[in-house]
Interface confidence: low
């Protein structure tokens, strides 16, 4: 059997400490622009509702976080930057901190697993392509191993 | 605050029972073609190694399952079908069972979370677009709520 590759969970052991610091940095960066947008926001309804928090705390947490970071970086901040060079500067700083957070979360795989590809699957695909015709026979012959994998996955999902 | 929408976790409570049945159906369907591909497979090395099983059992389990189902449906089976009408018929049946499994897993969100979008995020994006300019102000004004969401997510990830 192929040797296990390293997961490169660097920055994971000391992550809880760094996490508080990163969130504090985000809050500080946001405080630079909060008053400006507070004044501009004329509507009473809430955009980021309890439903969103529940998704963050549930089994869709990773997707919610990943999509919301992308949403702020791609859709919100570029439009918000149009309010002058000073606001743009602060938003750039906020955006960079958000990107840094995402990068660190990605590096420590268990924090953003939905953004990581399975290396083992990549290896299967690579081997499959190298084997040409024999790859099809082998993959089909081993379909029962695949069923065992599905079973193992589902067992864990039922326990979690 | 907007009312919570239903998660539509239909088929989840009785899923453990259905799961065994679905896997048994997959195994039975595979048994129809196993001998054929066993004879054709001339290589000793294993394609689906323990590394794959470990990814299925780890935090990349959902990605591994999602990618492997796609791999078999799109890359392996269409090539394997070329071995005559009888094999093609059995493989169609096997493929349908695999698609049914995926569909049921998707329906019970916690089993394939990586293939599900956060409905709360979709709602945020929809509301944001409806609000036009005010959406930008609101989204930026509520950035601290977003930070709270990130914090909640990370706390859960550190506990798990």
């Amino acid at each position: 059997s192929r040797g296990q590759y390293s997961r490169e969970d660097n920055n994971c052991t000391h992550f809880p400490v760094g996490q508080s610091h990163m969130l504090l940095e985000l809050r500080t960066a946001f405080s630079q622009v909060k008053t400006f947008f507070q004044t501009k926001d004329q509507l009473d309804n809430i955009l980021l509702t309890d439903s969103l928090m529940q998704d963050f705390k549930g089994y869709l947490g990773c997707q919610a976080l990943s999509e919301m970071i992308q949403f702020y970086l791609v859709e919100v901040m570029p439009q918000a930057e149009k309010h002058g060079p000073e606001i743009k500067e602060h938003l750039n700083s906020l955006g960079e901190k958000l990107k840094t957070l995402r990068m660190r979360l990605r590096r420590c795989h268990r924090f953003l697993p939905c953004e990581n590809k399975s290396k083992a699957v990549e290896q299967v695909k690579s081997d499959f392509n190298k084997l040409q015709d024999q790859g099809v026979y082998k993959a089909m012959n081993e379909f029962d191993i695949f069923i065992n994998c599905i079973e193992a996955y589902m067992m864990i999902k039922m326990k979690s | 605050s907007r009312g919570q929408y239903s998660r539509e976790d239909n088929n989840c409570t009785h899923f453990p029972v259905g799961q065994s049945h679905m896997l048994l159906e997959l195994r039975t369907a595979f048994s129809q073609v196993k001998t054929f591909f066993q004879t054709k497979d001339q290589l000793d090395n294993i394609l689906l190694t323990d590394s794959l099983m470990q990814d299925f059992k780890g935090y990349l389990g959902c990605q591994a399952l999602s990618e492997m189902i796609q791999f078999y449906l799109v890359e392996v089976m269409p090539q394997a079908e070329k071995h005559g009408p009888e094999i093609k018929e059995h493989l169609n049946s096997l493929g349908e069972k695999l698609k049914t499994l995926r569909m049921r897993l998707r329906r019970c969100h916690r089993f394939l979370p990586c293939e599900n979008k956060s409905k709360a995020v979709e709602q945020v994006k929809s509301d944001f677009n409806k609000l036009q300019d005010q959406g930008v102000y609101k989204a930026m004004n509520e950035f601290d709520i977003f930070i709270n969401c990130i914090e909640a997510y990370m706390m859960i990830k550190m506990k798990s």
Partner: antibody, heavy 119, light 106 residues
Framework: EVQLVESGGGLVRPGGSLRLSCTAS????????MAWVRQSPDKGLEWVAS????????YYRDSVRGRFTISRNNAKTTLYLQMDSLRSEDTATFYC????????????WGQGVMVTVSS | DIQMTQSPSLLSASVGDRVTLNCKTS??????LAWYQQKLREPPKLLIF???PLQAGIPSRFSGSGSGTDFTLTITSLQPEDVATYFC????????FGPGTKLELK
């Protein structure tokens, strides 16, 4: 300090009922899955039932399914096991246990409570 | 169901000895195995999870190894307070426990 304290055990006739309770302290109860495990001299340790942290899902061993009901009250930080149609083979010490986060090993156990089913 | 066997069922050893307890499963469970210590009239206490990591607060003389179907719990230098019954527990498929190894002093 994590503490799990069981109560409600005792002697009951075959076919009778008992309700076990487990009061938790020293940790955030709603953050953990909980389970009941029993131990008898003849069968050793046996997992009985589990419940998810928000009580959405419950799981039972085959021999107790339909007779036992696991439940929890997060506000009261209490886990329950309602046991009906008791049989002599249910005689055991019942332990309240905690699942660590989303993992599945049992990291803390209560002192246990004795359940005797006999005529 | 996954069957579990432990050997030996009874082990007599002296203080300071290196002690090895074995656990075997009927199928591959990878590293989904925990070890517990149970003293007389006490509940089981978690020592090891995921085959080798030591639970917080457990002395470093305890260590776990193995994966697949064969697992080992080692006590490098036996202490009087280690007299107990030791159970292995698999959580790969369902939840089952080994029958236990009773460890006593010679």
């Amino acid at each position: 300090e994590v503490q799990l304290v069981e109560s409600g055990g005792g002697l009951v006739r075959p076919g009778g009922s008992l309700r076990l309770s487990c009061t938790a302290s020293g940790f955030t109860f709603s953050d953990y899955h909980m389970a009941w495990v029993r131990q008898s001299p003849d069968k050793g340790l046996e997992w009985v039932a589990s419940i998810t942290l928000d009580a959405t899902y419950t799981y039972y061993r085959d021999s107790v399914r339909g007779r036992f009901t696991i439940s929890r009250n997060n506000a009261k930080t209490t886990l329950y096991l309602q046991m009906d149609s008791l049989r002599s083979e249910d005689t055991a010490t019942f332990y309240c246990t905690r699942h660590r986060g989303f993992s599945v090993w049992l990291d803390y156990w209560g002192q246990g409570v004795m359940v005797t089913v006999s005529s | 169901d996954i069957q579990m066997t432990q050997s030996p069922s009874l082990l007599s050893a002296s203080v300071g000895d290196r002690v090895t307890l074995n656990c075997k499963t009927s199928q591959n469970i990878f590293e989904n195995l925990a070890w517990y210590q149970q003293k007389l009239r006490e509940p089981p206490k978690l020592l090891i999870f995921n085959a080798s990591p030591l639970q917080a607060g457990i002395p470093s003389r305890f260590s776990g190894s193995g994966s697949g179907t064969d697992f080992t719990l080692t006590i490098t230098s036996l202490q009087p307070e280690d007299v107990a019954t030791y159970f292995c527990h698999q959580y790969y498929s369902g939840y089952t426990f080994g029958p236990g190894t009773k460890l006593e002093l010679k």
